[in-house]
Interface confidence: low
């Protein structure tokens, strides 16, 4: 029972996480949590960096500057894969949760 | 120097189909989100319709949901409306836009619009 | 949908003068509020971004403030290549993308 539920929590958060990411920059508190996450858990995206592709406020070529692997402003602009994490959130954050809940 | 150049507007009859074309040049094209808008003789301006870089994402008015589609080939540089079950109200000048690059939703470059009738 | 209403529809100002033009969200956009020029015969020109940010090559009589719902456009000292339509437009909730329907400003 608890590897189902752990499951259950484990794809309602990658579906809450990509919501928010649909909301992104646009919704400042959404941007200030996803900022958050990635820069505290150094990673970005859901399942990775290129989920961010497919977001329509985000552009080619750009992700969060959260992203980042020494964030400063504009760094996710233009990026260099070797300059930002590559790891998605989900993942990161859900082998945390199993660790740690 | 950004250049947008429409083509393809016609008259035509009510039901009939008909497709846009914008040749883009003076940028790089496939960085870049493009859209539609159009004007009705004398009215203001409507957006059409938007589609992002890759293809990935594509918007859509009301009015044109299900009878137009927005398309793009990044390796010709060009953009496409296909307008089908076209209307009286489509009879507009129809521009092809070009997105910022970190606002995609923000017009920057427009051409000089093709002429769209519809009337039997 | 988010509405865009400009006011007024329609003004007549002489050169030199400061002219305001206003435009109200029917719901919060931020700051994601952009104004168009349009001149008879020809394309629309994008003059303001992001509310304030003026496009490179527009002149700095063009400013624009804001944010939410209610902004403005304002020409400081307007000269005679000024009057044509302004267009306000929302890129806060999109698709669709709105705009406002028009503020023309003519010669008084």
């Known amino acids: 029972a608890g590897y189902v539920f752990r499951d259950k929590v484990m794809s309602e958060f990658n579906n809450n996480f990509r919501q928010q990411m649909e909301n992104y920059p646009k919704n400042n508190h959404t941007a200030s949590i996803l900022d958050r996450m990635q820069a505290d858990f150094k990673c970005c995206g859901a399942a990775n960096y290129t989920d961010w592709e497919k977001i329509p406020s985000m552009s080619k070529n750009r992700v969060p500057d959260s992203c980042c692997i020494n964030v400063t402003v504009g760094c996710g602009i233009n990026f260099n894969e070797k300059a930002i994490h590559k790891e998605g959130c989900v993942e990161k954050i859900g082998g945390w949760l199993r660790k740690n809940v | 120097e950004v250049q947008l150049v429409e083509s393809g507007g016609a008259l035509v009859q009510p039901g009939r189909s008909l497709r846009l074309s914008c040749a883009a040049s003076g940028f790089t094209f496939d960085d870049y989100a493009m859209h539609w808008v159009r004007q009705a003789p004398g009215k203001g301006l409507e957006w059409v319709s938007g589609?992002?870089?890759?293809?990935?994402?594509?918007g859509y008015a009301d009015s044109v949901k299900g009878r137009f589609t927005i398309s793009r080939d990044n390796a010709k540089k060009s953009l496409y409306l296909q307008m089908n079950s076209l209307r009286a109200e489509d009879t507009a000048l129809y521009y092809c836009g070009k997105g910022l690059l970190h606002q995609w939703e923000v017009l920057d470059y427009w051409g000089q619009g093709t002429l769209v009738t519809v009337s039997s | 949908d988010i509405q865009m209403t400009q006011s007024p529809s329609s003004l007549s100002a002489s050169v030199g003068d400061r002219v305001t033009i206003t435009c109200r969200a029917s719901q919060s956009i931020s700051s994601y509020l952009n104004w168009y020029q349009q001149k008879p015969g020809k394309a629309p020109k994008l003059l303001i971004y992001a509310a304030s940010s003026l496009q490179s090559g527009v002149p700095s009589r063009f400013s624009g403030s804001g944010s939410g719902t209610d902004f403005t456009l304002t020409i400081s000292s307007l000269q005679p290549e000024d009057f044509a339509t302004y267009y306000c437009q929302q890129s806060y909730s999109t698709p669709p993308i709105t705009f406002g329907q028009g503020t023309r400003l003519e010669i008084k």
């Open positions: 589609i992002s870089w890759n293809s990935g994402t594509m």
